[in-house]
């Protein structure tokens, strides 16, 4: 297993609709054709898996049904979008990239993007 640098923004604020987007960029040492991207969430000393997708270079990322993630790829960049976030989902979201094929296998883990989610205030009752 060889190490690889992965860069991602330090902080992102989710929209009022609970959507957060960030770019995960990896320094590919070779010509990988198959790449696996996994998003991990670290909060309260627990690390959980948010979503994962394997894609062939030049093709779209395909996440599993009912995943809260969507994404596109362009060269060595992956544009990730996480939907349906609530305040309780605030945490450090870490981008993990694996170059699966051809060998050798490379693994890179970013420092994480702190995503802040603020639940929208309920609309005040109107008397109309």
């Amino acid at each position: 297993c060889k190490a690889m640098h992965v860069a991602q923004p330090a902080v992102v604020l989710a929209s009022s609709r609970g959507i957060a987007s960030f770019v995960c960029e990896y320094a590919s040492p070779g010509k990988a054709t198959e790449v696996r991207v996994t998003v991990l969430r670290q909060a309260d000393s627990q690390v959980t898996e948010v979503c994962a997708a394997t894609y062939m270079m030049g093709n779209e990322l395909t996440f599993l049904d009912d995943s809260i993630c969507t994404g596109t790829s362009s060269g060595n960049q992956v544009n990730l979008t996480i939907q349906g976030l609530r305040a309780m989902d605030t945490g450090l979201y870490i981008c993990k990239v694996e170059l699966m094929y051809p060998p050798p296998y490379y693994l890179g883990i970013g420092n994480g993007t702190q995503i802040y989610v603020i639940d929208p205030e309920p609309c005040p009752d109107s008397d109309f």
Partner: antibody
Framework: QVQLQESGPGLVKPSQTLSLTCTVS????????VYWVRQPPGKGLEWLGV???????NYNSALMSRLTISKDTSKNQVSLKLSSVTAADTAVYYC?????????????????WGQGTLVTVSS | DIQMTQSPSSLSASVGDRVTITCSAT?????MSWYQQKPGKAPKLLIY???NLASGVPSRFSGSGSGTDYTLTISSLQPEDFATYYC?????????FGGGTKLEIK
């Protein structure tokens, strides 16, 4: 159809490592998580840990230092290893299919379970 | 860790009765599952995502709730419903189960 089957020794000596295998069929380990749950005789259910579709693991904090879960996707197998066992680890151990990731739009359930295997820790 | 308190811990009822089992969490959760377990058997999924009926489960079972309080209701008990029932939360790890409710025939 979806099936999970636990296998491993039924008797383990104290201080040794408990090793179990969950062999699955009818679904892919890259599309679902596999969750481990145990049940001491006459008691309730305790969640041990999970290996998600992407291969990441998460463990019950009470067992984290002793527990390892891994998978071999090509063999459709998930393994559980629990080290330094004591009599308190005597239980029926279940593997179950569950959501592929910790955060989903829907589908939060362990929908299929193995039949369970009784592991007794005794000298 | 989120603790799940199930009540009652045991319950005697008759065929045809309406039965409600409650589960209370120590902090607000998002999704709840309910399982049925018979002696010597693995748990069986009844309800997922708080209120959705699992495949093949009779419609007399229903789930509801939000925040910290959730319920499983059996509208008209059948002989095959006498078993132990467990709730389980999906909001944070470690996942936790309630202590179980043993439903016995009166």
């Amino acid at each position: 159809q979806v099936q999970l089957q636990e296998s491993g020794p039924g008797l383990v000596k104290p201080s040794q490592t408990l090793s179990l295998t969950c062999t699955v069929s009818g679904f892919s380990l890259t599309s679902y998580g596999v969750y481990w749950v145990r049940q001491p005789p006459g008691k309730g259910l305790e969640w041990l840990g999970v290996i998600w579709a992407g291969g990441t693991t998460n463990y019950n904090s009470a067992l984290m230092s002793r527990l390892t879960i891994s998978k071999d996707t090509s063999k459709n197998q998930v393994s559980l290893k629990l080290s330094s066992v004591t009599a308190a680890d005597t239980a029926v151990y279940y593997c179950a299919r569950g959501p592929p990731h910790a955060m989903m739009k829907r589908g939060y359930a362990m929908d299929y379970w193995g039949q369970g295997t009784l592991v007794t820790v005794s000298s | 860790d989120i603790q799940m308190t199930q009540s009652p811990s045991s319950l005697s009822a008759s065929v045809g009765d309406r039965v409600t089992i409650t589960c209370s969490a120590t902090s607000s959760i998002t999704y709840m599952s309910w399982y049925q377990q018979k002696p010597g058997k693995a748990p069986k999924l009844l309800i997922y995502d708080t209120s959705n009926l699992a495949s093949g489960v009779p419609s007399r079972f229903s789930g509801s709730g939000s925040g910290t309080d959730y319920t499983l209701t059996i509208s008209s008990l059948q002989p095959e419903d006498f078993a132990t029932y467990y709730c389980q939360q999906w909001s944070s790890y470690p996942l936790t189960f309630g202590g179980g409710t043993k439903l016995e025939i009166k």
